[in-house]
Each structure stands twice: as structure tokens, then as C-alpha cells.
């Protein structure tokens, strides 16, 4: 029999008080962590890294800093105004030797459209990335560089889940040894060839992503080559065999009935905590119908919420979620009709998701009013439409050309939306701000490394 492969990267996920403030409850924060980890797990599991397959992720531990921890002197993430480099450094100053990777999720608006930052792995002589152990660096501090951070806010707007999931996959991609994609083969979204361009860029593209193009949640061949070399050398250092759920991480996994954490965290009358004996931990207590750790349709008194109680807010594209009275999980919401306007009239609903462009409502395709096409820079943050597969017809929604659809009304992109062919993001003044893909990384390296170690950090 072949021995089980070490293919699981165990994660430590922390969230700061601002992330908690945005999502509102521990359960909602845990649901966010879970959806992010599931998303990257799907991406990595379905990628063949030059023969290394089924790379998966598991949350080993979480720490949720609530608004109550905002003033706690032991909470390193309590400060309100921290730049992205400092924020990553605060994560790296903790000892993360027990984990493959350690991430902090936040809801901060970092400068220049930065959605995340992470140390880059390398096959040898690396300082950073997967399995990297805590050590002393030339700035005199011990650091763990198996770290990264992501934020869910950009230019004052919250990024869609699919973009945030890709950001996480992107930063973890750096940890796994991939630099940013470059060259024509690995940046098809920059191609002049329309057929290639329409599939978009890959996960490790240096600048902006919309998350809805075919390549957006796939690794390029460039990334696969780099990641496979790092996996070959590093995974035996800290990856584990996949299998048992981790009781105590606060997330209900296959084989558990509930998970309220360890005894010091468990505020749940319904679930046996992770300090209990093997046969009981992460099981429901006798006579209890459910545990709030299973989902939002369970009361603190361990009973299913009654039919008609709301468990998910109404959104642009889906009606509110309503408990059904016999499960703790929030049932799927009914979708609103396709082509309902969403995201402040810049997009339309497709199958319950705010996914299509407003252009699609009129049988048109979205295009970029990109400056390379001789368009006015002022139009870079307009929603622009063109006839299908005909870029020569690309014009702003405010143009005479599309006045029969938009009545001369200029629809502007939401702040934080990709612009200028994914080279940047729109700010609140409707200026397209180019992403400085490697700036923060260079600054942080200079701050803590000797010059010969400058190679290993990336957004």
C-alpha cells in the first residue's frame, strides 16, 4: 500500500476588530473564513502542479478579534491607521511555527488599491512562504515569514466575494512560490488578440481582477512551474496528510456535528467543546437540536429557529434567506429575476449573483474605455459598452451612441472597480488609479532585510 501523501497545508487565520465590525458576529466571521478557505481549497485541489495533485487547506486554529479587543494591549492589530507593510509585519512578529501559513483578514482601505500582501516562497535559501519557521532577521527581530494578509475593502467599497477569494488564492500563491505573472503566455488579458483577451488574466496577475473571466481563478503555466518547484522541496517540512477534521477550530467540518472551539472560547450550551474526551468533543449535547456553530438558524437555546425567521439579508440579486424550522443552516435564497440592476446600476443579476455588466441588459458587451485606444482619461471610470466582438464600437454609457439605452446618463464604475484594462482601480473621485504591484513589498524588504534577501515578498 502507498503511504498517504502530505498534501494539506494547515492554516492559522486571525481576523482583526475591523473585520468583525463589518461582519457583525462571530458566526458571520467564521462563515467568511470558511468560504475563503473553501474557495482556495477548490482552486488548489483542481490544479495539477506538475504531477503534485490534491493540494488542500485546513484551518487548524482561528482567532477572532472582536470590537471588544480594540483596546486590548495584547492585540497587535488594534491600531486604527496601519499601512499594509506594517500590518503584514505585525502578523509576522508572532510565532507561527505550528502552521503551514498564517493569515490575517481585515476590513481596511490600504493605499493604492492593495488588497493583500504576502511573503514569497522559493525552493531554496528562502526567507518566506510555506513552512517557513520563525527566526531572527537583520532588523534584530524574530519573525515568521509564512504569512500574509488580505483586506475586503478597496477605495471605500467592499470587494465582491469572488474577488476576495481570488485575492486570497493570489497571496497564498506567493507563499507557494509564485511571483506575478508576466510575458504574453501568462498574461492573456493584456493580449491584442480578442479571443485570448476575453478569457482574462490568471490568479497571479499583478494588477486588478474582476473575478468573472474564465482564467481569473486558474493558475497560469508560469505559476504552476514555480509553485511545483517549491512544493517539491518544501511540502514535507510542514504539510500533513488530509483526513481528520480539526475539532476546536470553530468550523464545522465533515465528521463533526458542531464546533464551538476550546473550553476557553466555547460560549455554546449545545455543543461539547474541544477539551472534552474523544467520543464527545464536537458532538451535540444530549437532547439538543442544534448548535449556533452549525449555522444561523439555531438559537442560543439549541433549538431550530422557527419558520419565517430571517437568516440572510436581502441583496441586490437574491431575496432574504428564511429559516425553514428544521435545520440550523440558512436555506438558499430565491434569486431575483435575471437582468435586475445591481451594484448601483453598473451590473445585472445572473442566477442570483451580481455578475453581468449593465451592457448585457441591452445585448451589448462591457469594454474598457482604455487610454491606449485614444480615449479620454476621464472615461476610464465610466461603464463602457460595445457591440459584441466589435471593439471599434466601444463607448461610454453617456455617449450619443448608446443614448437610446441610457438616455445620455453616464453610469460610472463603483469605487474599487477594475479600470483601464485591469491596470488599476477606480477611486472615489472616479479616477483610474494604477496599481503599483510591487511597491509595498520593496519597502518592507528594505526595512527588515539585508540587501541579499530582498527577493521574497509580493502583493
Amino acid at each position: 500500500t502507498t503511504s498517504a501523501e502530505k498534501n494539506t497545508c494547515q492554516l492559522y487565520i486571525q481576523t482583526d476588530h475591523l473585520f468583525f465590525k463589518y461582519y457583525g458576529t462571530r458566526e458571520a466571521v467564521i462563515a467568511q473564513i470558511s468560504s475563503h478557505v473553501k474557495a482556495i481549497d477548490t482552486i488548489y485541489q483542481t490544479t495539477d502542479f506538475s504531477g503534485i495533485r490534491n493540494i488542500s487547506f485546513m484551518v487548524k486554529r482561528i482567532r477572532i478579534n472582536t470590537t471588544a479587543d480594540e483596546k486590548d494591549p495584547t492585540n497587535p492589530f488594534r491600531f486604527p491607521n496601519i499601512g499594509v507593510e506594517k500590518f503584514l509585519e505585525l502578523n509576522s512578529e508572532q510565532n507561527h511555527d505550528d502552521y503551514c501559513l498564517a493569515y490575517v483578514f481585515t476590513d481596511r482601505d490600504f493605499d493604492d488599491g492593495v488588497l493583500g500582501l504576502a511573503w514569497v516562497g522559493a525552493p531554496s535559501g528562502s526567507s518566506g512562504g510555506i513552512c517557513e519557521k520563525s527566526k531572527l532577521y537583520s532588523d534584530g527581530k524574530k519573525k515568521s515569514l509564512n504569512t500574509g494578509i488580505i483586506t475586503v475593502q478597496n477605495y471605500g467599497s467592499h470587494v465582491p466575494p469572488k474577488v476576495s477569494h481570488i485575492t486570497f488564492a493570489h497571496e497564498v500563491g506567493h507563499n507557494f512560490g509564485s511571483p506575478h505573472d508576466s510575458g504574453t503566455e501568462c498574461t492573456p488579458g493584456e493580449s491584442k488578440n480578442l479571443g485570448q483577451k476575453e478569457n482574462g488574466n490568471y490568479i497571479m496577475y499583478a494588477r486588478a481582477t474582476s473575478g468573472d473571466k474564465l482564467n481569473n481563478n486558474k493558475f497560469s503555466l508560469c505559476s504552476i512551474r514555480n509553485i511545483s518547484q517549491v512544493l517539491e522541496k518544501k511540502r514535507n517540512n510542514c504539510f500533513v496528510e488530509s483526513g481528520q477534521p480539526i475539532c476546536g477550530n470553530g468550523m464545522v467540518e465533515q465528521g463533526e456535528e458542531c464546533d464551538c472551539g476550546y473550553s476557553d472560547q466555547c460560549k455554546d450550551e449545545c455543543c461539547f467543546d474541544a477539551n472534552q474526551p474523544e467520543g464527545r468533543k464536537c458532538k451535540l449535547k444530549p437532547g439538543k437540536q442544534c448548535s449556533p456553530s452549525q449555522g444561523p438558524c439555531c438559537t442560543a437555546q439549541c433549538a431550530f429557529k422557527s419558520k419565517s425567521e430571517k437568516c440572510r439579508d436581502d441583496s441586490d440579486c437574491a431575496r432574504e434567506g428564511i429559516c425553514n424550522g428544521f435545520t440550523a443552516l440558512c436555506p438558499a435564497s430565491d434569486p431575483k429575476p435575471n437582468f435586475t440592476d445591481c451594484n448601483r446600476h453598473t451590473q445585472v443579476c445572473i442566477n442570483g449573483q451580481c455578475a453581468g455588466s449593465i451592457c448585457e441588459k441591452y445585448g451589448l458587451e462591457e469594454c474598457t474605455c482604455a487610454s491606449s485606444d485614444g480615449k479620454d482619461d476621464k472615461e476610464l471610470c465610466h461603464v463602457c459598452c460595445m457591440k459584441k466582438m466589435d471593439p471599434s464600437t466601444c463607448a461610454s454609457t453617456g455617449s450619443v451612441q448608446w443614448s437610446r439605452h441610457f438616455s445620455g446618463r453616464t453610469i460610472t464604475l463603483q469605487p474599487g472597480s477594475p479600470c483601464n484594462d485591469f491596470r488599476g482601480y477606480c477611486d472615489v473621485f472616479m479616477r483610474c488609479r494604477l496599481v503599483d504591484a510591487d511597491g509595498p513589498l520593496a519597502r518592507l524588504k528594505k526595512a527588515i532585510f539585508s540587501p541579499e534577501l530582498y527577493e521574497n515578498i509580493a502583493e
Epitope: 464545522v252 465533515q254 451535540l284 435545520t327 436555506p331
Partner: nanobody, 118 residues
Framework: EVQLVESGGGLVQAGGSLTLSCAAS????????LGWFRQAPGNEREFVAS????????YYADSVKGRFTISRERAKNTMYLQMDSLRPEDTAVYYC???????????WGQGTQVTVSS
């Protein structure tokens, strides 16, 4: 993928009893909840009872409470629904279903017909 197969349905007189079985094959159960649902002609499918696979905690719809008993036999990968004091309004196709982590009752059997005559 887990396959669920119901059996034990049939024709019974009001006040009588019947036991339904749901056998699971495929990946062994690590699902945390299994349930029975029913659908009468022209009606929506409705919840009847559920049980957690590991700790055997049970839950019943008000309409069957005190008359139906849900149980499971882990060694046989089988769940049961003991139905006593049956009424004509219990006539329906009965389905078993499993609820997985994060997926509310996403796998269903093909159903077994229960008819209660008055």
C-alpha cells in the same frame, strides 16, 4: 457519493403501524444529520423527522410528534422511521435525505409510497 434507498412503504389501515428503512451505500456516513420528508399529491415536500448520525439527537415535526420514532443503526448504515397510529393524512411518498456540512439536505432517495386507508 452516498446513495440513499428507502423501503418499507405500503398500504395500511388507519391506526396501524409501518416501519420505513433508509439504507446508505457509498461513502460511509460522516454527515451530521439524516432526515425523513414526505410529499402528498399536490403538496410541497414537508419535513417529518431528523436524527444526528453520531449522537442520535432527534427532532420531529409537530404533526408526527408522539406517533413517529426516528432511529439509526450505525453498524448497518441504516436509518428507520417507526410510524404508529397512522392517519389518512399521513398518506404520501416518504423520502430520506442527508444533510452535510454546509449543505441543507442536499442528497435524496427515490422515495417509498405510504398509503393509509380509512
Amino acid at each position: 457519493e452516498v446513495q440513499l434507498v428507502e423501503s418499507g412503504g405500503g398500504l395500511v389501515q388507519a391506526g396501524g403501524s409501518l416501519t420505513l428503512s433508509c439504507a446508505a451505500s457509498g461513502r460511509t456516513f460522516s454527515s451530521y444529520r439524516l432526515g425523513w420528508f414526505r410529499q402528498a399529491p399536490g403538496n410541497e415536500r414537508e419535513f417529518v423527522a431528523s436524527i444526528t448520525w453520531s449522537s442520535a439527537n432527534t427532532y420531529y415535526a409537530d404533526s408526527v410528534k408522539g406517533r413517529f420514532t426516528i432511529s439509526r443503526e450505525r453498524a448497518k448504515n441504516t436509518m428507520y422511521l417507526q410510524m404508529d397510529s397512522l392517519r389518512p393524512e399521513d398518506t404520501a411518498v416518504y423520502y430520506c435525505a442527508k444533510e452535510d456540512v454546509g449543505k441543507p439536505f442536499d442528497s435524496w432517495g427515490q422515495g417509498t409510497q405510504v398509503t393509509v386507508s380509512s
